[in-house]
């Protein structure tokens, strides 16, 4: 806490400007009116306040807005956002995507902090669903964002938002998450032609059922081994040797290198040796 002391004569701030960086902590506390600070928040980030001085500015805003800051203040917090606790952020009502972007920019280059997670949670809950623009923004800052959501949370993602998802956004998703996302992707991309459809759906295939894999095997898609290895084991097991050969195309030779790993290992054990021999890869069932 900063002690309450009278502002020295002639030091009362008439506006938020760079002269304030030369004020000591107690002078900032005594000479800067909280209401003035709130109305001129857009200037704060353009002034190189010390980290120490930011503590005073936060204290002033906390006193002025004990129930939580208004969005007009939040959108201009800049580096002050780093001083906020999750408890502070839970009091906010953030509705503007521009505000969200401005605050995420301050955290750029870092893992998602508890503050950012709370901010995103408040924002998404306020919107009711993860719309395309929000998802675009969040995955741009945090490629792993989608995979940090529970299957229940992912169920609120509308299929139209799936267009914003890039392959790298799904790198850390587990099968349960892909189970939720795959049907949405299938719906989102349903009007695309064969080869274009496969390019888009490929990174979601970890959630695909057997019948969809069988259908893909009829379309000369040439699935790479990396994608095949991410398929659900229970979806791969019922596929015949001929279907896997068609699914992988020229990549079928890669099965040999993966014969000890799931799902290839389990699939091999389900096949007749005669059928495996037709591949000419020396796979032993």
């Amino acid at each position: 806490e900063v002690e309450k002391t009278a502002c020295p004569s002639g030091k009362k701030a008439r506006e938020i400007d760079e002269s304030l960086i030369f004020y000591k902590k107690w002078e900032l506390e005594a000479c800067v009116d909280a209401a003035l600070l709130a109305t001129q928040m857009d200037r704060v980030n353009a002034i190189p306040f010390t980290y120490e001085q930011l503590d005073v500015l936060k204290h002033k805003l906390d006193e002025l807005y004990p129930q939580g800051y208004p969005e007009s203040v939040i959108q201009h917090l800049g580096y002050l956002f780093l001083k906020m606790s999750p408890e502070d952020i839970r009091k906010w009502n953030v509705t503007s995507l521009e505000t969200l972007k401005a605050l995420l920019e301050v955290n750029k280059g870092h893992e998602m902090s508890p503050q950012v997670a709370t901010l995103i949670d408040r924002f998404v809950k306020g919107r009711g669903q993860l719309d395309k623009d929000t998802l675009d923004t969040l995955t741009a800052f945090y490629p792993g964002y989608l995979c940090s959501l529970s299957p229940e949370e992912l169920s609120s993602v509308p299929p139209s938002s799936i267009w914003a998802v890039r392959p790298q956004d799904l790198d850390t998703c587990d099968p349960r998450q892909l189970d939720v996302l795959y049907p949405k992707a299938r719906l989102a991309f349903q009007n695309m032609n064969g080869s274009e459809y496969f390019v888009k759906i490929q990174s979601f295939l970890g959630g695909a059922p057997t019948e969809d894999l069988k259908a893909l095997s009829q379309q000369n898609v040439s699935m790479d081994l990396a994608t095949f290895m991410k398929l659900r084991t229970d979806a791969v097991l019922p596929l015949t040797v001929a279907e896997v050969q068609k699914l992988l195309g020229p990549h079928v030779e890669g099965l040999k290198a993966e014969e000890r790993h799931r799902p290839v290992r389990d699939w091999i054990l389900r096949q007749r040796q005669d059928d495996l021999d037709t591949l000419g890869l020396g796979l032993q069932g």
């Epitope: 760079e18 002034i47 190189p48 120490e52 503590d55």
Partner: antibody, heavy 116, light 107 residues
Framework: EVQLVESGGGLVQPGGSLRLSCAAS????????IHWVRQAPGKGLEWVAS????????TYADSVKGRFTISADTSKNTAYLQMNSLRAEDTAVYYC?????????WGQGTLVTVSS | DIQMTQSPSSLSASVGDRVTITCRAS??????VAWYQQKPGKAPKLLID???RLYSGVPSRFSGSGSGTDFTLTISSLQPEDFATYYC?????????FGQGTKVEIK
């Protein structure tokens, strides 16, 4: 891609002057604070000066105050360190770095040797 | 000025070891501390800021903690590429100051 490239270092006699440049790419220096940090041979890091280009606010270490001047040319996206009245103890590798508080990107450094 | 005192000034460790470096500020700096790694002939690289925030691309074996005056950088399992000098920096108040460095050498 963010890059900072220093230049202008070299050998100078005590009492002499040098101007170091720090050319930035991948971001605009008006958006970020630029710092100069030096490292004497075999020693640790020492903050020298900072400039916040939007407002032109500058700040200096006591050891260089009155002798060194930090500036920026926003049209060239370049920061400078004008070093006057150089002393033997100013011998160091000079790095420019960016960031309001912590420094997330650094240049490769330029060596300044002050010797007669 | 705020003094940052690092300890130890050097240490010898083996690959796989857990390494802890401490930094003490001469006055309260809240969480206004960053950690850097520097290899010979190279510029420092940011590892951690705000005492504990891992910078992107930095392996998760690095972690930071502390608040007030006492701060710690921990490497949970030392890797060959981690042999370097580590510096703490306080940016809570001007002038920003660095610790004197801790050199991590191969045992």
């Amino acid at each position: 891609e963010v890059q900072l490239v220093e230049s202008g270092g070299g050998l100078v006699q005590p009492g002499g002057s040098l101007r170091l440049s720090c050319a930035a790419s991948g971001f605009t220096i008006t958006d970020r604070t630029i710092h100069w940090v030096r490292q004497a041979p075999g020693k640790g890091l020492e903050w020298v000066a900072s400039i916040f280009p939007t407002k032109g606010v500058t700040t200096y270490a006591d050891s260089v105050k009155g002798r060194f001047t930090i500036s920026a040319d926003t049209s060239k996206n370049t920061a400078y360190l004008q070093m006057n009245s150089l002393r033997a103890e100013d011998t160091a590798v000079y790095y420019c770095a960016r960031g309001r508080y912590w420094m997330d990107y650094w240049g490769q450094g330029t060596l300044v040797t002050v010797s007669s | 000025d705020i003094q940052m005192t690092q300890s130890p000034s050097s240490l010898s460790a083996s690959v796989g070891d857990r390494v802890t470096i401490t930094c003490r500020a001469s006055q309260d700096v809240k969480e206004g501390v960053a950690w850097y790694q520097q290899k010979p002939g190279k510029a420092p690289k940011l590892l951690i800021d705000q005492s504990h925030r891992l910078y992107s691309g930095v392996p998760s074996r690095f972690s930071g903690s502390g608040s007030g005056t006492d701060f710690t950088l921990t490497i949970s399992s030392l890797q060959p590429e981690d042999f370097a000098t580590y510096y703490c920096q306080q940016y809570y108040a001007w002038p920003s100051t660095f610790g004197q460095g801790t050199k991590v050498e191969i045992k």
